[in-house]
């Protein structure tokens, strides 16, 4: 019993003075607490606590569950104790078989014993399985065996606690151990669709995965720049031990423009969180928005290929597209292709191949798109880039010498004389008309000079030149003149191209 | 023998706060899991968390994360639900349960929380 | 999470009947055998009172006549020989797995 010096109050005493104390089951329990100022006895054992205010604690049939500890209480708050087992071989252990671990803490498997004086007192696996080899143990008799350091690896790691009595091992009730993960990581969070474009009254729905050790991960969807509760659904699974996912999916029945924004999912546990976003975009009608990858205006050699591109944005789903030359539609010779295989693309493309372009196929190309919405289009002026052809050179009934050219772009028409028989015609003669006329063919063709000079200003025998020219090359024709006496006798003309 | 005594009923204003206590007596009040379980007006019965023994560690159902906290204070063995933003959908009775031995064998009384503007 | 559904959802019976009900786990709450299953009981006004713990152990203090029985997913409640007494809402719930659920309860009404 406790000594305590003279003056300071003291703890009360107990009959039978010892700690611990074993009674056979049917035989009576008597304890006495002795103390000037006595309050109460209290017994604790798994699930109860009984108090008594009398200071003989009497239970005349002892049961396996009066074994416990019996505490009498002073008025000045100090106590003595007593445990006392009550041997009942039919009844080993007290037991409460709900048992959670938390990873990497110390747990109690709850089966004190009722016998103090049997052996070998430990944890076994159910059904004769081995227990895990790192799995660490203390006994106690009084309160059951503490696991050391719980592992994962535990989870669901069904074992009953042990004893031998008289040679036999003695089994106590299975006890199954649930483990609460510690997080060690943040959550995995991912979105359905990083992006939404929606019209007014359409359904916004958007989901959130949410993946973690346990069902204790914390998750929302939350507007940014807003306190505003968001209505929300879960789905969950357990993909087995410590593989849990969640699906929380955010719904907006009716989206209206001002429901723009972006919106958070956000997930912690208590090591940290992790979020992702999703922006949505509603509008109050469709579009098409259309740009053009090269010039709208587009110059191309004779012969040449080119390829007319557009990108462009379409919402909702573009439902036809059309290139058009001269009020007639291309059935092929174009493709047209999203940008990207992403579910939420609505940039497209759209190519017109056109190939060995002739000169005479210059002009407006139009490419025209359309939704449900709106209808777009875009128009290319292409023109051929021709080398000058001279239509006509001829010496007109005035004594004139007529030359007419067309390609494009203009060509200019220079004149040059060659004296006798060189070849080099190097002396420019000046032109006394020239004249661009209008083109019967399409807006976009070849463009026709003419040009005119006086052919009495020669005077010797040789060549007139008539060199018809533009960035893409040039073309001659000429004049040979003759002279008998006086008289120009003969004017041939033929042509001399020139690449 | 084993008692959860619950507080009072409790009317709120929707957006407000309500914190509902459990106190415990006849066991080892720091020995056992206390969950809490809430019935909406003829409704059923729904488990809305759990506050470990020993560490105090919480597991909430992810209906009412970021709204419940669940504490102890094992000077008094009394166990306290907190739900916050509350929404006439609260209007409940809310039950503490004990849970030994795997089951919820002991349940306090319920207290009735309204929500009403 | 576990969803349990109970049928039928009402039931009307005489004093004396043999009364079954039924729940319907949507995944396993066994573990080694031992399901995480159990039964409560509920009154008008009252909190719940715990009938039968791990799908088939009889709680103290309640009479014989309830018994409780199943595995894996499929779980039943008897009550041999109705009395008055038993006249109530009857729920299964289960503790395998976190969120822990409850069915949504079969009232038991007299005939």
């Known amino acids: 019993q406790p000594s305590v010096s003279p003056g300071e109050p003291s703890p009360p005493s107990i009959h039978p003075g010892k700690s611990d104390l074993i009674v056979r089951v049917g035989d009576e329990i008597r304890l006495l607490c002795t103390d000037p100022g006595f309050v109460k006895w209290t017994f604790e054992i798994l699930d109860e606590t009984n108090e008594n205010k009398q200071n003989e604690w009497i239970t005349e049939k002892a049961e396996a569950t009066n074994t416990g500890k019996y505490t009498c209480t002073n008025k000045h708050g100090l106590s003595n104790s007593i445990y006392v087992f009550v041997r009942d071989p039919a009844k080993l252990f007290l037991v409460d078989r709900s048992l959670y671990g938390k990873e990497d803490n110390d747990t109690l498997v709850r089966c004190p014993l009722t016998d103090p004086e049997v052996t070998n007192y430990s944890l076994k696996g159910c059904q004769g399985k081995p227990l895990p080899k790192d799995l660490r143990f203390i006994p106690d008799p009084k309160a059951g065996i503490m696991i050391k350091s719980v592992k994962r690896a535990y989870h669901r790691l069904c074992l009953h606690c042990s004893v031998d009595q008289e040679g036999k091992s003695v089994l106590s009730e299975k006890f199954i151990l649930k483990v609460r993960p510690a997080f060690k990581a943040v959550p995995v969070v991912s979105v359905s669709k990083a992006s939404y474009l929606l019209r007014e009254g359409e359904e916004f729905t958007v989901t959130c995965t949410i993946k973690d050790v346990s069902s204790s991960v914390y998750s929302t969807w939350k507007r940014e720049n807003s306190q505003t509760k968001l209505q929300e659904k879960y789905n969950s699974w357990h993909h087995g031990d410590f593989n849990y996912e969640r699906q929380a999916t955010l719904t907006i029945s009716s989206a209206r423009v001002n429901d723009s924004g972006v919106f958070m999912c956000y997930a912690n546990n208590t090591f940290g969180s992790a979020n992702v976003t999703t922006t949505l975009e509603v509008v109050d009608k469709g579009f098409i928005n259309i740009f053009p990858m090269i010039n709208t205006t587009v110059f191309v050699n004779d012969g040449e290929n080119v390829d007319l591109i557009v990108e462009y944005e379409a919402f909702p789903k573009p439902e036809h597209q059309q290139w058009i030359y001269m009020n007639r539609t291309f059935t092929d010779k174009w493709e047209d292709y999203p940008k990207s295989e992403n579910e939420s693309n609505i940039r497209y493309v759209s190519e017109l191949h056109l190939t060995r372009l002739k000169g005479t196929e210059g002009g407006t190309y139009t490419f025209l798109v359309s939704n449900s919405d709106v209808n777009a289009a875009i128009a290319f002026n292409v023109y051929v880039n021709t080398k000058p052809e001279i239509l006509t050179y001829d010496r007109l009934v005035n004594g004139m010498l007529q030359c007419v050219a067309a390609g494009f772009p203009e060509p200019t028409i220079d004149w040059y004389f060659c004296p006798g028989t060189e070849q080099r015609c190097s002396a420019s003669v000046l032109p006394v008309d020239v004249q661009t006329l209008n083109s019967s063919g399409p807006p976009f063709g070849k463009l026709v000079v003419q040009s005119s000079i006086d052919s009495s200003a020669f005077k010797h025998n040789g060549t007139v030149e008539c060199k018809a020219y533009n960035d893409v090359g040039k073309t001659s024709a000429y004049f040979n003149f003759a002279f008998k006496g006086n008289n120009k006798e003969q004017i041939h003309p033929h042509t001399l191209f020139t690449p | 023998q084993v008692q959860l005594v619950q507080s009072g009923a409790e009317v709120k204003k929707p957006g407000a706060s309500v914190k509902v206590s459990c106190k415990a007596s006849?066991?080892?009040?720091?020995?056992?899991?206390m969950h809490w379980v809430r019935q909406a007006p003829g409704q059923g019965l729904e488990w809305m968390g759990v506050?470990?023994?020993?560490?105090?560690?919480?597991s909430y159902n992810q209906k009412f994360k970021g709204r419940v906290t669940m504490t102890t204070d094992t000077s008094t063995s009394t166990a306290y639900m907190e739900l916050r933003s509350l929404t006439s959908d609260d209007t409940a009775v809310y039950y503490c349960?004990?849970?030994?031995?795997?089951?919820?064998?002991?349940w306090g009384q319920g207290t009735l929380v309204t929500v009403s503007a | 999470e576990i969803v349990l559904t109970q049928s039928p959802s009402s039931l009307s019976a005489s004093v004396g009947d043999r009364v079954t009900i039924t729940c319907r786990a949507s995944?396993?709450?066994?573990?080694?055998?031992?399901?995480?299953m159990h039964w409560y009981q509920q009154k008008p006004g009252k909190a719940p009172k715990l009938l039968i713990y791990?799908?088939?152990n009889l709680e103290s203090g309640v009479p014989s006549r309830f018994s409780g029985s199943g595995s894996g997913t499929d779980f039943t409640l008897t009550i041999s020989s109705l009395q008055p007494e038993d006249f109530a809402t009857y729920y299964c719930?289960?503790?395998?797995?976190?969120?822990?659920?409850f069915g949504q309860g079969t009232k038991l009404e007299i005939k």
């Open positions: 349960a004990r849970e030994r031995d795997t089951r919820f064998g002991n």
């Open positions: 006849g066991y080892t009040f720091t020995s056992y899991n």
């Open positions: 506050i470990y023994s020993g560490n105090g560690d919480t």
């Open positions: 995944e396993s709450v066994d573990i080694y055998g031992e399901s995480f």
């Open positions: 791990l799908a088939s």
């Open positions: 719930q289960q503790n395998n797995e976190e969120p822990y659920t």
